[in-house]
């Protein structure tokens, strides 16, 4: 499918001051936008609150690797 | 926007070994899963080996187990791949892959892909 011609850009401004635990995480997607000021980290939690995170942060890092273990398709 | 510039590839004999390096720029190494991915003249790019953002969780295809290493230098923005015990049937380009999104070792969900170098294992 064509990309959509001016698509809104979803930006982090600010990022989560706070560790979250990976219990209440439920997804991430990065944004990579050169539209953005910051590279990010968006946090879906399991309740469906979005939340801006720094990858720079280990704990953020940490969390994704956590997260992408989880859609590891198990070997049989 | 991540850049990666693979090297070490050549033409090595059956039983021997090479490194791969992938060298990153142009992002925040460590918060990107990283692989590496072979193909050969019409099949579909395959998944060799990852690893995790930490260095602390490692993927391997089965068919290199125990003969191919992935590492990472967080440090330096690299990427390694040991390759020992080299076969004839390794023989391929091998495409170095960096994921931002969600996800494992399927190709699709890698965002950011070096050029490829070759590597021949003539028997």
């Known amino acids: 499918q064509p990309d959509a011609i001016n698509a809104p850009v979803t930006c982090c401004y600010n990022f989560t001051n706070r560790k979250i635990s990976v219990q209440r995480l439920a997804s991430y997607r990065r944004i990579t936008s050169s539209k953005c000021p910051k590279e990010a980290v968006i946090f879906k939690t399991i309740v469906a609150k979005e939340i801006c995170a720094d990858p720079k942060q280990k704990w953020v890092q940490d969390s994704m690797d956590h997260l992408d273990k989880q859609t590891q398709t198990p070997k049989t | 926007e991540v850049q990666l510039v693979e090297s070490g590839g050549g033409l090595v004999q059956a039983g021997g070994s090479l490194r791969l390096s992938c060298a990153a720029s142009?992002?925040?190494?460590?918060?990107?899963?990283m692989a590496w991915f072979r193909q050969t003249p019409g099949k579909e790019r395959e998944f060799v080996t990852l690893?995790?953002?930490?260095?602390?969780?490692?993927d391997y295809t089965d068919s290199v187990k125990g003969r191919f290493t992935i590492s990472r230098d967080n440090a330096k923005n690299t990427v390694y791949l040991q390759m020992n015990s080299l076969k004839p049937e390794d023989t391929a380009v091998y495409y170095c892959?960096?994921?931002?999104?969600?996800?494992?070792?399927?190709?699709?969900?890698?965002?950011?892909w070096g050029q490829g170098t070759q590597v021949t294992v003539s028997s």
């Open positions: 892959a960096a994921a931002g999104s969600m996800g494992w070792n399927h190709f699709r969900e890698y965002d950011y």
């Open positions: 142009g992002g925040t190494f460590s918060s990107y899963r």
């Open positions: 690893i995790s953002r930490s260095g602390g969780t490692t």
